[in-house]
Amino acid sequence: FERTRSLQDPCSNCPAGTFCDNNRNQICSPCPPNSFSSAGGQRTCDICRQCKGVFRTRKECSSTSNAECDCTPGFHCLGAGCSMCEQDCKQGQELTKKGCKDCCFGTFNDQKRGICRPWTNCSLDGKSVLVNGTKERDVVCGPSPADLSPGASSVTPPAPAREPGHSPQ
């Protein structure tokens, strides 16, 4: 079948990195600068992606593969193939339509992207709060109160200045 196809269509012999040049009797010509073909049998080469503005080149374009972009520091990629750069926030914040805003009490974000999420509700698992939650960190759940031997208590570090820091009930 491949042999039959190549007899019918000389372009099928053109490898990746070349194109079948109709202007030159359908011979295989190398892709021009700043273009590529990732598969064989192409009649044209695709223009290389240019990483400009807040986009940085993560991988250079070659004759057989497109360039890949990421984002300049302070931004992160969104979408397939990094189609958009979104501004980072600090840990303990989330990006809103009005910019980076601190997580509300009872929520946290331990990354520079994404939204603030509620602290774990330890009591739902029958556990107690071992370490208080903050804007940047989830609570740490400890053993259930019943698991503690008489006279023993869970160690609770000093609460952060801004928050009394118990799990929301």
Epitope: C51, G53, V54, S83, M84, C85, E86, Q87, L95, G99
Partner: nanobody
Framework: QVQLQESGGGLVQPGGSLRLSCAAS????????IAWFRQAPGKEREWVSC????????YYADSVKGRFTVSRDNAKNTVDLQMNRLSPEDTAVYYC???????????????WGQGTQVTVSS
């Protein structure tokens, strides 16, 4: 032809001021958020400030807060960046950009200017 053009750069002494301007031709700046970026020699491009299209809300990088002020004049089709109390760390090429969505999201086909050089030195 659609383009952005920065102006107002130059050499200034530490502690001095400069006012950069971003002008548009071929489209209305009033329809876009306008952001300022800068790139110092050998460093990555850095977001500096942005002014929204809708309510002219302004946002600033921590490094320039209290020193830089961004404003827009839709009648003149310009956005200005007033830079006060400049230090050598502010030396860079300054670019304006017009993101299609808002101050916090950027695409490859956004409009960008060619940049204007700001040098802070005694």
């Amino acid at each position: 032809q659609v383009q952005l053009q920065e102006s107002g750069g130059g050499l200034v002494q530490p502690g001095g001021s400069l006012r950069l301007s971003c002008a548009a031709s071929g489209f209305s700046l009033g329809l876009y958020a306008i952001a300022w970026f800068r790139q110092a020699p050998g460093k990555e491009r850095e977001w500096v400030s942005c002014i929204e299209k809708s309510d002219s809300s302004a946002y600033y990088a921590d490094s320039v807060k209290g020193r830089f002020t961004v404003s827009r004049d839709n009648a003149k089709n310009t956005v200005d960046l007033q830079m006060n109390r400049l230090s050598p760390e502010d030396t860079a090429v300054y670019y304006c950009a017009a993101p299609q969505s808002d101050c916090f999201h950027y695409k490859e086909n956004d409009y960008w200017g060619q940049g204007t050089q700001v040098t802070v030195s005694s």
